[in-house]
């Protein structure tokens, strides 16, 4: 797969092949893994691919299976960047001010919070 | 401040002790705190949280910018008990592969991609 | 192909205000802020501020604070700058530019639009 | 605010010089600082971000140098299309701050 296919182009495939490859997937029923108990799943990306691993390595691989854990490890190289993108650029605090405002903001719009 | 406050309501006094206190906290004019280049906020909790750190050693403490510094701590928590949240439910694949069809679904519509 | 579109040219009277747009289109609006700079006749870039689609949040050169607002519609993608009681030394060209970041370097920016406040 | 003095003010040269021009910025600004081109009746353009990254698709003639106050753009070998004014922006704190241009003339 060229690493050059947009990520959002690679995030809809991978839900196609999700899809499709499902059976293969849910043969092992002895299998667990763990599942975040919220929606705030940006939060949980660490666990969510840990998972993404165990699952692999428990599936028989072979045609178009492979493509969709090859699309899921590009998918966490692309997490992988953002996460570092986090913390390379030091700001005046002006900046950072503005930032925390924005997430703090959207935490309180956005996230899922348990009251 | 009671711990028992809704999140939602901690959020929301933190987001006005911020313009409050603005003036003071931007006194410091060299110090640089890493600001994430992108808005996937979610991604970057430990490092926002160390930015707040590196505030609070620099900012002279008294009053209400205490209470500020105290609610960022809360929040904290809050998102730590979510990250908590992440891993401690094994379940099984059918489970986990509906969390990973949600996940790429979010991703697919409300994260912040680049192309 | 990501582009920043503005209004057309506009003649105002000393005291009025003016109201000049920026259409966005070619990528995800709220995903990057909105600078908006001036540029009088002769003379170099002066920056107004930006404001964050992503939550409405301007912020604004002192100079400008109290006579620019800046403003968004998300529904068409289009940023807003409006500068109020208006003088000869206002008029310019007014330039939207995109933020490449948050807080970054500037790599999109719109055509300009000619503001001229005369009597 | 942090000021942005740029020099020359002007400059004259041939094609296929060295132009060298400087920005010198009253505080440190790490290297938040970028370079603009911007033709006669046209909109800027920005050649250069962070001190030193050039921008996808500006020719490699086009590099920039330096960090903390003192920085520099540099066009290995002046092409006709280069003929322009040049101006520093400073994005390290608001309000963010240009230099006051450089213009490359003719010879």
């Known amino acids: 797969i060229p690493t050059e296919i947009p990520t959002s182009a690679l995030v809809k495939e991978t839900l196609a092949l999700l899809s499709t490859h499902r059976t293969l997937l849910i043969a092992n029923e002895t299998l667990r893994i763990p599942v975040p108990v919220h929606k705030n799943h940006q939060l949980c990306t660490e666990e969510i691919f840990q998972g993404i691993g165990t699952l692999e390595s428990q599936t028989v691989q072979g045609g178009t299976v492979e493509r969709l854990f090859k699309n899921l490890s590009l998918i966490k190289k692309y997490i992988d960047g953002q996460k570092k993108k986090c913390g390379e650029e030091r700001r005046a605090v002006n900046q950072f001010l503005d930032y925390l405002q924005e997430f703090l903001g959207v935490m309180n719009t956005e996230w899922i919070i348990e009251s | 401040i009671p711990t028992e406050i809704p999140t939602s309501a901690l959020v929301k006094e933190t987001l006005a002790l911020l313009s409050t206190h603005r003036t003071l906290l931007i006194a410091n004019e060299t110090l640089r705190i890493p600001v994430p280049v992108h808005k996937n906020h979610q991604l970057c909790t430990e490092e926002i949280f160390q930015g707040i750190g590196t505030l609070e050693s620099q900012t002279v403490q008294g009053g209400t910018v205490e209470r500020l510094f105290k609610n960022l701590s809360l929040i904290k928590k809050y998102i730590d008990g979510q990250k908590k949240k992440c891993g401690e439910e094994r379940r099984a694949v059918n489970q986990f592969l509906d969390y990973l069809q949600e996940f790429l679904g979010v991703m697919n519509t409300e994260w912040i991609i680049e192309s | 192909q990501v582009q920043l579109v503005q209004s057309g040219a506009e003649v105002k009277k000393p005291g009025a205000s003016v109201k000049v747009s920026c259409k966005a289109s070619g990528y995800t609006f709220t995903n990057h802020h909105i600078n908006w700079v001036r540029q009088a006749p002769g003379q170099g870039l002066e920056w107004i501020g930006y404001?964050?689609?992503?939550?409405?949040?301007?912020r604004y050169n002192q100079k400008f604070k109290g006579r620019a607002t800046l403003t968004v519609d998300k529904s068409t993608s289009t940023a807003y700058m409006e500068l109020s009681s208006l003088r000869s030394e206002d008029t310019a060209v007014y330039y939207c530019?995109?933020?490449?970041?948050?807080?970054?370097?500037?790599?999109?920016w719109g055509q300009g639009t000619l503001v001229t406040v005369s009597s | 605010d942090i000021q942005m003095t740029q020099s020359p003010s002007s400059l004259s040269a041939s094609v296929g010089d060295r132009v060298t021009i400087t920005c010198k910025a009253s505080?440190?600004?790490?290297?938040?600082l970028s370079w603009i081109q911007q033709k006669p009746g046209k909109a800027p353009k920005t050649l250069i971000h962070r001190a030193d990254r050039l921008i996808d698709g500006v020719p490699s003639r086009f590099s920039g140098s330096g960090s903390g106050q003192d920085f520099t753009l540099t066009i290995s070998s002046l092409q006709p299309e280069d003929f322009a004014t040049y101006y520093c922006?400073?994005?390290?704190?608001?309000?963010?701050?240009f230099g006051q241009g450089t213009k490359v003339e003719i010879k």
């Open positions: 505080q440190d600004i790490n290297s938040y």
């Open positions: 922006l400073q994005y390290d704190d608001f309000p963010y701050t």
């Open positions: 404001i964050n689609p992503y939550n409405d949040y301007s």
């Open positions: 530019a995109r933020d490449y970041g948050n807080f970054w370097y500037f790599d999109v």
